[in-house]
């Protein structure tokens, strides 16, 4: 029986040109998360596999940054980024959980909430802690 629930940031807004963190969290289950897929309508943004690291879709590679955690940082926002985003958690043994986030990208200088998230700088203690470039693996 699937007992888990996905918590998301819900409906969020951000300024054009800014950045946003898309974040989901799976709770109320002991299922192991094997992979999280991030999708926008029928487009794949990214995949984070627990063992194999990150895959970033080439159409987003210049403005999507992996993380923090299983989340996704979307940069250089345009009004065309407005829409639904889905985090799809593949778990064992439960199966698949899906969370939904609605992002509105505003032309105005002030977004209601969810604007101006700090983007991780990528400063790490030592080489072994750096995310891998290849398939985006982490140690």
């Amino acid at each position: 029986m699937m007992t888990g629930t996905i918590e998301t940031t819900g409906n969020i807004s951000a300024e054009k040109g800014g950045s946003i963190i898309l974040q989901c969290h799976l709770s109320s289950t002991t299922a192991q998360v094997t992979q999280v897929n991030w999708e926008q309508q029928d487009q794949l943004l990214a995949i984070c596999n627990a063992d194999l690291g990150w895959h970033i879709s080439p159409s987003f590679k210049d403005r999507v940054a992996p993380g923090p955690g299983l989340g996704l940082t979307l940069q250089s926002l345009t009004v065309n980024d407005t829409g639904e985003y889905f985090c799809i958690y593949h778990t064992y043994p439960d199966g698949t959980y899906t969370g939904r986030i609605f992002l509105e990208v505003l032309e105005s200088s002030v977004a209601e909430h969810g604007a101006r998230f700090q983007i991780p700088t990528g400063d790490y203690k030592d080489d072994d802690d750096k995310p891998n470039k290849g398939s985006g693996t982490t140690s």
């Epitope: 897929n37 627990a50 063992d51 970033i56 080439p58 398939s135 693996t137 140690s139």
Partner: antibody, heavy 119, light 107 residues
């Protein structure tokens, strides 16, 4: 230039084990995962699994889990696949393959290692 | 596991022809599909990744399209050197799976 150099052909008896190596050069070994693919009868490809050389984390195809073991030696930038309890169905060519930059598609492949299981 | 079906095991074509090789996934895989070319006695070679992106150095006669469950690999003008087996592969979810391959034969 990225290169994946695999060990030579193997003739093994049923029930035995085989360990294939994949020596890499031309890139930083720990920055890319390494994958293993089986090809039977020159046609069908099957993903066996992949390994993260940074931390040894592995992802296996359930079909091979328990019989296949993926390991790495970071000091020599070499990946290994061991396959145990061999049967004639394991006679195939085995490839190591490396995916791209933040991309799961495998853009570099070894030359393949032929394994023949026969008594 | 996701099953990738290449309905044609063999396709026969002539030099200069346009050829479409299809691949169908048993469930949606978004655009997480790659296409590989394998010539006799050689290792597979990546041609197309993320359904429609041509890999570095691949001639522009090779294109890929599709999303969800239906994918197409196209050679706009077949050359003699295109004699090979073409494999599709999904990497949407592990275990990554391949199609059965389509062998392109030149008349």
């Amino acid at each position: 230039e990225v290169q994946l150099q695999q060990s030579g052909p193997e003739l093994v008896k049923p029930g035995a084990s085989v360990k294939i190596s994949c020596k890499t050069s031309g890139y930083t070994f720990t920055e890319y995962t390494m994958h293993w693919v089986k090809q039977s009868h020159g046609k069908n490809l099957e993903w066996i699994g992949g390994i993260n050389p940074n931390n040894g984390g592995t992802s296996y195809n359930q079909k091979f889990k328990g019989r296949a073991t993926l390991t790495v030696d970071k000091s020599s930038s070499t990946a290994y696949m061991e396959l145990r309890s061999l049967t004639s169905d394991d006679s195939a060519v085995y490839y190591c393959a490396r995916p791209g930059w933040y991309n799961y598609a495998m853009d570099y492949w070894g030359q393949g290692t032929s394994v023949t299981v026969s008594s | 596991d996701i099953v990738m079906t290449q309905s044609h095991k063999f396709m026969s074509t002539s030099v200069g022809d346009r050829v479409n090789i299809t691949c169908k996934a048993s469930q949606g895989v978004s655009t997480a599909v790659a296409w590989y070319q394998q010539k006799p006695g050689q290792s597979p070679k990546l041609l197309i990744y993320s359904a429609s992106y041509r890999y570095t150095g691949v001639p522009d006669r090779f294109t890929g399209s599709g999303s969800g469950t239906d994918f197409t690999f196209t050679i706009s003008s077949v050359q003699a050197e295109d004699l090979a087996v073409y494999h599709c592969q999904q990497h949407y979810i592990t275990p990554w799976t391949f199609g059965g391959g389509t062998k392109l034969e030149i008349k």
